[in-house]
Amino acid sequence: EPPGPEQRVVRRAAEVPGPEPSQQEQVAFGSGDTVELSCHPPGGAPTGPTVWAKDGTGLVASHRILVGPQRLQVLNASHEDAGVYSCQHRLTRRVLCHFSVRVTDAPSSGDDEDGEDVAEDTGAPYWTRPERMDKKLLAVPAANTVRFRCPAAGNPTPSISWLKNGKEFRGEHRIGGIKLRHQQWSLVMESVVPSDRGNYTCVVENKFGSIRQTYTLDVLERSPHRPILQAGLPANQTAILGSDVEFHCKVYSDAQPHIQWLKHVEVNGSKVGPDGTPYVTVLKSWISENVEADARLRLANVSERDGGEYLCRATNFIGVAEKAFWLRVHGPQAAEEELMETDEAGSVYAGEQKLISEEDLGGEQKLISEEDLHHHHHH
């Protein structure tokens, strides 16, 4: 839907950066403007499929938000549209362009293309260092000090408050108290204990708007512990037939974890074995020597056969953590809005799955002692 006669289009463009992450471009728009952000490679080189996100969350196309491969339009902008917009490579999630968008009361003149005079404008809060807010899961041993930061700006200068598990969080809520460093937009907790586990949300607001970020804290009561997977990963994805897809699974384990990518399959028309456990095939399997591992599963040239339910599983000698997720594969005629959807997280299965190899679909590989870890299955 093209902008109507009353709406003005203000364009902002950024070149695709080199290997270094792009500097965040500060841009301002007036209330009611059509925001247009474009992200073009130098010399017209193709960037591959891209997705747009606002404050780290994938944007869904709507009657007001028009999403194109290297272009984003937001019609009739309001304060709620302020925030950090990023254009990312769909497969690698590499950020190609970063815009910090502020929406002011007055319509913009359209002549502040360089964004240098926006500091004087009034506007909703925005993150000033979003790249430093990527680590949403923090797993630390008991007795350590934890600091959460939400560096932000806005005019007037926004206030910051903190929630724990959705409720107001104050110093008297924990033994040892908390330190709120408003100048640094941070919450500090010293000598954390297991009762400090939970979701911590910073809420940054002024009269023009409010933004928030949630971090998850896991306090490791003792070592060793069973593996921990970062919440929200791997995320469900929808892909076009023939495209490449990459999934991420972040594993935290202080005892060498065996990491597996698995796919649910059917055997003789059945998804489960005689004992009720699902059939799965091992796509990738290895042992990580690192406390933190960023596991990646790349599927090239996907076909409809690749669609279905997958698992990222991490096992050590203490126990198992796993996350189920889905890949949906559509023909090229699939609506672009559907490709932009950010699906809900998949369900988690506590039980063991039946592992099957391509050579022996009936065979079962029992879960998992360390010996099993040395007999990898690569398919």
């Epitope: 000698f317 203490i318 198992v320 039980g351 029992k366 879960l367 002692s369 360390e370 870890l373 040395h374």
Partner: antibody
């Protein structure tokens, strides 16, 4: 804090089946491995086998023909059965958390095989 | 099965001294899947070290583990009176998971 408690008869007759249960408190039994280990009179430690919360098991090959480990997640318990026992099976039997190396142990229960 | 040999069988030292306990395996242990336990009289063993060198929670930093392949060492940098007990090594890289015969640490 996870705690494990073994229970079962302290005296078993030769050729009978030794049965022990381990009750886990302080944490869910789900998503963890659970083991049985015994300590023979000469203080030698011997791994018997382990079970995952789904019921998947692995046993010491030297005992495999006689051992069964099972789990009841609703009761937060897992059990050991050792059949056709002889005097050589006299030992302190420990239940523990972990598949192989273990971090939490029960206090152990002495089982004597004698007629 | 993998056989673990601990040496010496008994080690006589004084409080404050440094203790070095050895554990040799009959085959190479991949990925450092070796653990050390301490056992006090009448108690269950207690995990000290896993992954050959990682200290379990609550274990004083005077205990350290090292080694790879077939040769592993438990070092107690400065012996305290409560350290004079029995220590076992265990490999958990290959089933059946086996233990050493133990080293008894006694006061000289």
């Amino acid at each position: 804090q996870v705690q494990l408690q073994e229970s079962g008869p302290g005296l078993v007759k030769p050729s009978e089946t030794l049965s022990l249960t381990c009750t886990v408190s302080g944490d869910s039994i789900n998503s963890y491995f659970w083991s049985w280990i015994r300590q023979l009179p000469g203080k030698e430690l011997e791994w018997i086998g382990h079970i995952y919360s789904s019921g998947s098991t692995r046993y010491n090959p030297s005992l495999q023909s006689r051992v069964t480990i099972s789990i009841d997640t609703s009761k937060n318990q897992f059990s050991l059965k050792l059949s056709s026992v002889t005097a050589a099976d006299t030992a302190v039997y420990y239940c523990a958390r972990g598949a192989s190396a273990v971090d939490y142990w029960g206090q152990g229960t002495l089982v004597t095989v004698s007629s | 099965e993998i056989v673990l040999t601990q040496s010496p069988g008994t080690l006589s030292l004084s409080p404050g001294e440094r203790a070095t306990l050895s554990c040799r395996t009959s085959q190479s242990i991949s990925s450092g899947y070796l653990a050390w336990y301490q056992q006090k009289p009448g108690q269950a063993p207690r995990l000290l070290i896993y992954g050959a060198s990682r200290r379990a929670t609550g274990i004083p930093d005077r205990f350290s583990g090292s080694g790879s392949g077939t040769d592993f060492t438990l070092t107690i940098s400065r012996l305290e009176p409560e350290d004079f007990v029995v220590y076992y090594c265990q490999q958990y890289g290959s089933s059946p998971y086996t233990f050493g015969q133990g080293t008894k640490l006694e006061i000289k």
